[in-house]
Amino acid sequence: LPVCGQPSRALPNLVKRIIGGRNAELGLFPWQALIVVEDTSRIPNDKWFGSGALLSESWILTAAHVLRSQRRDNTVIPVSKDHVTVYLGLHDVRDKSGAVNSSAARVVLHPDFNIQNYNHDIALVQLQEPVPLGAHVMPICLPRPEPEGPAPHMLGLVAGWGISNPNVTVDEIIISGTRTLSDVLQYVKLPVVSHAECKASYESRSGNYSVTENMFCAGYYEGGKDTCLGDSGGAFVIFDEMSQRWVAQGLVSWGGPEECGSKQVYGVYTKVSNYVDWLLEEMNSPRGVRELQVER
């Protein structure tokens, strides 16, 4: 049985930010998936991408908002499975030759996903064929099913191919077409922020932000380190000392309207521990349960 949450290459202690850039070495995040969605049901076709985390040979965990149609902002229309491609073992997006690519057999959004406040922002992709596991493709562990989630000040890692330049605004990307997505997988180390502090930081803003009990926040008050556009759905992983394994405690979900990495703008993550039962239920094929590992 494949072991979850144990990369073949040890993760280093010192980690810089996705914003500003630190390249991940190949094999550091063997559970990391690139999810490419091309919605051909709309004309012109819409194309976007996000991240996900391998849970087993057949299942990818990601955020629901990555897998919803982009053309109707106030509706939750899942994209067709035919429009989803998943890449595993990918390091540099310019070179997909060493990666395993798979189409989707099923796309499952959480039934209560709320497009207004991103509550229950969690989803699964079942792969068409089980992927071969190896040094560069390995699953992440699920946390214990508990409502507390990760404690404040705990440090977690998150990786992605999202926007890596904090000085480029979304408008500038549109106007200039500047390429600001990272070719090489980036990663960052971030501390979990207390629910009260995060809630307060969003309540102080104009706009209707809701940090629910199904979310937690991470980041630095002073800014500078953050996840960003295109990192969505990627796993926020924390090392569990007891089991000596990495565990997917969060999923990159949303942030404030300010630029990524801004001061006192914490990233908001889906609290995975609230959904372990739902995940297991959805993956409840005999093979799915056998493959899957939950941190005990």
Partner: antibody, heavy 113, light 112 residues
Framework: QVQLKQSGAELMKPGASVKLSCKAT????????IEWVKQRPGHGLEWIGE????????NYNEKFKGKATFTADSSSNTAYMQLSSLTTEDSAMYYC??????WGTGTTVTVSS | DIVMTQSPSSLAVSAGEKVTMSCKSS????????????LAWYQQKPGQSPKLLIY???TRESGVPDRFTGSGSGTDFTLTISSVQAEDLAVYYC????????FGGGTKLEIK
């Protein structure tokens, strides 16, 4: 070439229902959303809703919920919109269109007692 | 609903002149994930069905003459016809599909 041919003009009595058709040719019908739009002189264009023929998924403008119902028949590459409990306010030109791009020929519906 | 406001409601120009018309939305039409503005421009000639000219705010539909140019981002958009021809007599509508779609009231272009 992509074409959407709509059914002929309809003259209906208030309270009746009418079913408009939109036959698609020149592309894979099941894979693209079909939208429906209402046009009345002096009222501009109003989006009624849409259907994805391959899955039967629908989205409706709140204003037209209960008024319009969409269906699609993949075997004949035809989308349908049924309008119920007709009133004079429903007198208009109705268009189907493929997602954002190609518009149908339009069907005039007149409701009069 | 997102409200689309077009101006002017009508204008009359001579053939060969440059024309600009405006479309403003009540909220941003920029989708940060796809990095596209979901704004289209349509032309409706008298007695005809509308025809797509521009999508994603600035991308010209194939077969549309290059005298038609769309620009703008966020909430402010413009359709420019660099040198108006007699066959451009029509009503021009903008439509947002960021949310449940809504159309602008239209700009009627008349040729002097």
């Amino acid at each position: 070439q992509v074409q959407l041919k709509q059914s002929g003009a309809e003259l209906m009595k208030p309270g009746a229902s009418v079913k408009l058709s939109c036959k698609a040719t020149g592309y894979t019908f099941t894979g693209k959303w079909i939208e429906w739009v209402k046009q009345r002189p002096g009222h501009g264009l109003e989006w009624i809703g849409e259907i994805l023929p391959g899955t039967g998924s629908t989205n409706y403008n709140e204003k037209f919920k209960g008024k319009a119902t969409f269906t699609a028949d993949s075997s004949s590459n035809t989308a349908y919109m049924q309008l119920s409990s007709l009133t004079t306010e429903d007198s208009a030109m109705y268009y189907c269109l493929r997602s954002e791009d190609v518009w149908g020929t339009g069907t005039t519906v007149t409701v009069s007692s | 609903d997102i409200v689309m406001t077009q101006s002017p409601s009508s204008l009359a120009v001579s053939a060969g002149e440059k024309v600009t018309m405006s479309c403003k939305s009540s909220q941003s039409l920029l989708n940060s994930r796809t990095r596209k503005n979901y704004l289209a421009w349509y032309q409706q000639k008298p007695g005809q069905s509308p025809k797509l000219l521009i999508y994603w705010a600035s991308t010209r539909e194939s077969g549309v003459p290059d005298r038609f140019t769309g620009s703008g981002s966020g909430t402010d958009f413009t359709l420019t016809i660099s040198s108006v021809q007699a066959e451009d007599l029509a009503v021009y509508y903008c439509k947002q599909s960021y949310n449940i779609p809504t159309f602008g009231g239209g700009t009627k272009l008349e040729i002097k």
